[in-house]
């Protein structure tokens, strides 16, 4: 399955989004840093099938689209940029959705590394708990969207290498 | 609010098969994984597998990859759990739960359809 | 596989007494993936204390939850007779998921 180019050019939207998003300095929000334990192995994709490397990326967007969408999210962020964002998570969701299909159908049912999908849960499970015990804080919401900017970072590296094993 | 919908009871043959239902409403049904669970009477908890309503990718127990398939509709927003070749062991309720994460992992339930294999 | 050890299987407790329930882990499971549920007969289970320690919305205070590593424990401070119900530990540390065997809570 080749991803579209339209997807790099909607990752690249949502980061421009996530950047956009910021309401206040991080540097206000230093004592609110933690680290969330990002689960890089999984997307230094050497040892992936290419099956397996989409269902990571899928998970990482699903995840990120549901943290968003929760009602926690709606107040803390603008809901203009917010619904900008689904819309740009959703089409990378269906173009990703479309390529797994694809792989499934492909002679049955890759093997797929459930460990790492249950690494991209855990990352996010860390997320959701921090922001529940700063009770959904302005800086706990900052810190988080610095977060899922440098995942979505990450992300774009194994996409980059997946259009590259096409 | 989130619902999930299972039919109350099936009663089946011996070596038969029985498809159990589980329709999602109050949601996006393709942004979370739908598990399911076993419950012999009077006994725990089984997780048997989850599957992705996204994409259909399916994650299963090993002691379960043989006797049940998960599928999904999208179009009726439902997700499906065959069991095959029953035999009395398999009578149970059998549960849909909606993942999720924090306060939101197995926060919704079935509830739960009773299947009973006899002859 | 993780196996979840609960003791007791069944206890009954009275009126304001205060009740301990301990789910032993096989292996070490991280605190974060350690849950509790409540089951009353004929009903679906229901969340009642994630990752740990934290108590699911609507559950009363007189619950809390702690443990590490292989150890954890469901208490509640003061028995009601509408805390009489199964409570199931679960994980989802690693694949599979797993429950444990459930303790019966009874009113005396």
């Known amino acids: 399955c080749d991803l579209p180019q339209t997807h790099s050019l909607g990752h690249r939207r949502t980061m421009m989004l996530l950047a956009q998003m910021r309401r206040i300095s991080l540097f206000s929000c230093l004592k609110d840093r933690h680290d969330f334990r990002f689960p890089q192995e999984e997307f230094d994709g050497n040892q992936f099938q290419k099956a397996e490397a989409i269902s990571v990326l899928h998970e990482v967007i699903q995840q990120t689209f549901n943290l968003f969408s929760t009602k926690d999210s709606s107040v803390a962020w603008d809901e203009r940029l917010l619904d900008k964002l689904y819309t740009e998570l959703y089409q990378q969701l269906n173009d990703l959705e479309a390529c797994v299909m694809q792989e499934v159908w492909v002679g049955g049912t890759p093997l797929m590394n459930e460990d790492s999908i249950l690494a991209v849960r855990k990352y996010f499970q860390r997320i959701t708990l921090y922001l529940t015990e700063k009770k959904y804080s302005p800086c706990a919401w900052e810190v988080v969207r610095a977060e899922i900017m440098r995942s979505f970072s990450s992300s774009r590296n194994l996409q980059e290498r997946l259009r590259r094993k096409e | 609010q989130v619902q999930l919908q299972q039919p109350g009871a099936e009663l089946v043959k011996p070596g038969a098969s029985v498809k159990l239902s589980c329709k999602a409403s109050g949601y996006t049904f393709t942004n979370y994984w739908m598990h399911w669970v076993k419950q012999r009477p009077g006994q725990g908890l089984e997780w048997i597998g989850e599957i992705n309503p996204s994409h259909g990718r399916t994650i299963y127990n090993e002691n379960f990859k043989s006797k049940a398939t998960l599928t999904v509709d999208k179009s009726s927003i439902t997700a499906f759990m065959q069991l095959s070749s029953l035999t009395s062991e398999d009578s149970a309720v059998y549960f849909c739960a909606r993942g999720g994460l924090g306060p939101a992992w197995f926060a919704y339930w079935g509830q739960g359809t009773l299947v009973t294999v006899s002859a | 596989q993780i196996v979840l050890t609960q003791s007791p299987a069944i206890m009954s407790a009275s009126p304001g007494e205060k009740v301990t329930l301990t789910c032993s882990a096989g292996s070490s499971v991280d605190s974060s993936y350690l849950y509790w549920y409540q089951q009353k007969p004929g009903s679906s289970p229901k969340l009642w204390i994630y990752?740990?320690?934290n108590l699911a919305s609507g559950v009363p205070a007189r619950f809390s939850g702690s443990g590490s590593g292989t150890s954890y424990s469901l208490t509640i401070s003061s028995m009601e007779a509408e805390d009489a119900a199964s409570y199931f530990c679960h994980q989802w540390s690693s694949y599979p998921f797993t429950f444990g065997s459930g303790t019966k809570l009874e009113i005396k």
């Open positions: 990752s740990t320690s």
